[in-house]
């Protein structure tokens, strides 16, 4: 267990041109406050996933009124640190979001109004117990300067706050197997405190508060022997000593989520989906109102009408969830028609359309033949978002611009020779065959299966295919 601490040093215009306008005015005095959200690991899921490590809200800063004509200075800040307690081990790598909020104190109907001025996010490595780390982040024309650290709460020590220290019981040495607690050399590392009730014979722990079972034992406290009866549907390795292994406790067993939160298993642990009005790793943080700035991603907070709707977040496009914490996968709704590719750009959806389709959602089937002439007497045929030319004899290619080789398909039968001709092809038939494609055998008595050849053409002469 421990505390992540954030100290805001300044919030004001960043360097360079385009200084932002002051967020407050004589007509609309305002004050700032900050919100920090922490998540374990170096995940990219900065804005939309829950603040699994915790979240905190600063006090309100002093009321500020802009001096007319003066550039926006560094704005007056709230006193004190933002502190995010963490109950479990410090993960070492974490993602953060720091939001700067403006509270307008003008004559609004219905009390003060909140708006998000800036949001910065980042991913960092940090060992607990180390010195303050300084950082500068920019959001648009604004610049935020801050420091942060993670410190363990006694008796925890170490870079992950997982080792426990106790004062020495004997002046000279620690107990068997226990080392001195650097840097607190006058204290000794304490044995891990497992989950209350964890069986000392059959359970052990590697983290405070857990209870892991030795082989052959199961249950949340490792007090239940694994069944040795024969298994109808084995769920794990079986051996002569343990028989069939029933699954050990899952991370959601006993539902670790408080206040009606629902638990879902994740690859490494569990995640609580909290009802409105609660948040935190186990939905343990309650009593949230709009004054706590519970809406993420620029969501607008309005007061709810009963304790189960303590506040309501009206989410901006692209976000959902009771705290606007989930990014909507808008492409999952398959908005692009006719096989278009969907791109979610965050601020907008784009559809990349297949050839022959257009429109914001690829809903328009283009007239494939419009403005597309087929050359050399070909005719255009529409189909499937693309156009095709049916070419006149002797021409080919996409637009009938290529002169076709009529002999390419070997149209003359029975060994006839093919000759390309300006109006088509001519077959010179082998002896004994006749017809436009040499398809008819000549009868042995000199007659043929066709009418007599026209005058001037003897059987065996080339027959022009008209």
């Amino acid at each position: 267990a421990g505390v992540f601490e954030l100290q805001i040093h300044s919030f004001g215009p960043g360097p360079g041109p385009g200084a932002p306008r002051s967020p407050c005015s004589a007509r609309l005095p305002c004050r700032l406050f900050f919100r920090v959200c922490l998540k374990p690991g170096l995940s990219e899921e900065a804005a939309e996933s829950p603040c699994a490590l915790g979240a905190a809200l600063s006090a309100r800063g002093p009321v500020y009124t802009e001096q007319p004509g003066a550039p926006a200075p560094d704005l007056p800040l709230p006193d004190g640190l933002l502190q995010v307690p963490f109950r479990d081990a410090w993960p070492g790598t974490f993602s953060f979001i720091i939001e700067t909020w403006r509270e307008e104190l003008g004559d609004q109907i219905g009390g003060p109004a909140w708006s998000l001025l800036a949001r910065v996010a980042g991913r960092r490595r940090l060992a607990a117990g180390g010195p303050w780390a300084r950082d500068i982040q920019r959001a648009g024309a604004w610049e935020l300067r801050f420091s942060y650290r993670a410190r363990c709460e006694p008796p925890a020590v170490g870079t992950a706050c997982t080792r426990l220290c106790r004062p020495r019981s004997a002046p000279s040495r620690c107990g068997p197997g226990l080392r001195p607690c650097a840097p607190l050399e006058d204290e000794c590392e304490a044995p891990l405190v497992c989950r209350a009730g964890c069986s000392p014979e059959h359970g052990f722990c590697e983290q405070p508060g857990e209870c892991r079972c030795l082989e052959g034992w199961t249950g949340p406290l490792c007090t239940v022997p694994v069944s040795t009866s024969s298994c109808l549907s084995p769920r794990g390795p079986s051996s002569a000593t343990t028989g069939c292994l029933v699954p050990g406790p899952g991370p959601c067993d006993g539902n670790p989520c408080a206040n009606g939160g629902s638990c879902s298993e994740t690859p490494r642990s569990f995640e609580c989906t909290c009802p409105r009005g609660f948040y935190g790793l186990r939905c343990e943080v309650s009593g949230v109102t709009c004054a706590d700035g519970p809406c993420f991603n620029g969501g607008l907070c309005v007061g709810g009408a009963d304790p189960d709707s303590a506040y309501i977040c009206h989410c901006p496009p692209g976000f959902q969830g009771s705290n606007c914490e989930k990014r909507v996968d808008r492409c999952s709704l398959q908005p692009c028609r006719n096989g278009g590719l969907c791109l979610d750009l965050g601020h907008a959806l784009r559809c990349r359309c297949r050839a022959g389709f257009a429109g914001p959602r690829c809903e328009h089937d283009l007239d494939d033949c419009a403005g597309r002439a087929c050359a050399n007497g070909g005719t255009c045929v529409e189909g499937g978002g693309a156009h095709r030319c049916s070419c006149a004899l002797g021409f080919g290619g996409r637009d009938c611009r290529e002169r076709a080789d009529p002999c390419a398909a070997r149209p003359c039968a029975h060994g006839g020779r093919c000759y390309a001709h300006f109006s088509g092809l001519v077959c010179a038939c082998a002896p004994g065959y006749m017809g436009a494609r040499c398809e008819f055998p000549v009868h042995p008595d000199g007659a043929s299966a066709l009418p007599a050849a026209p005058p001037g053409l003897r059987p065996g002469d080339p027959q022009r295919y008209l």
Epitope: G304, A305, P307, S309
Partner: antibody, heavy 117, light 109 residues
Amino acid sequence: EVQLVETGGGLVQPKGSLKLSCAVSAFTFTTYAMNWVRQAPGKGLEWVARIRNKSNNYATYYADSVKDRFTISRDDSQSMLYLQMNNLKIEDTAMYYCVFHYDYVYWGQGTLVTVSA
Amino acid sequence: QAVVTQESALTTSPGETVTLTCRSSTGAVTTSNYANWIQEKPDHLFTGLIGGTNNRAPGVPARFSGSLIGDKAALTITGAQTEDEAIYFCGLWYSNHLVFGGGTKLTVL
């Protein structure tokens, strides 16, 4: 538009029973706590009962005047709210409204319960 | 059991500003009471006006506003209209129990 339609009211004798129903449409019924509120003739409003949602284990709460006589329940699959009224008294005569609170209070049109000998 | 008290009757003129209040017997009304204001017109026609102390319902005219004034919840009608003549109830939540005030009969003369 959110709609709450109450049915089941009527004339009943003292110590009798009646079951009111409320059909809900156009919002995610499963998410919200639901309430029954009543108004006796010529009187003000009185909250009667409340049932929370599944994630709050369908916890129920009652006004002292109806405790142990009335039972509030819900059927999330049908988006229905119910009020089972037993051992009715003359002072239970009122218009009964199905109500839920979100950003403000949403009301049904009511159903009249008359308890009379 | 908490008791919620409202003015029994108020009279105002068209165009005037009038404030109805809602007091709790348990102490100051806070945002944790999620003050709700409901309008009743003849024939049992109820309309939710304000939820969560100051959240005006969609379609409710901007002249209606909710707030906390001192230790009470308040409904202010800025520039009352004749059609605002009605009975106004406030409801306060105490954990999971809702308590209504007796209602204020507003007359707009």
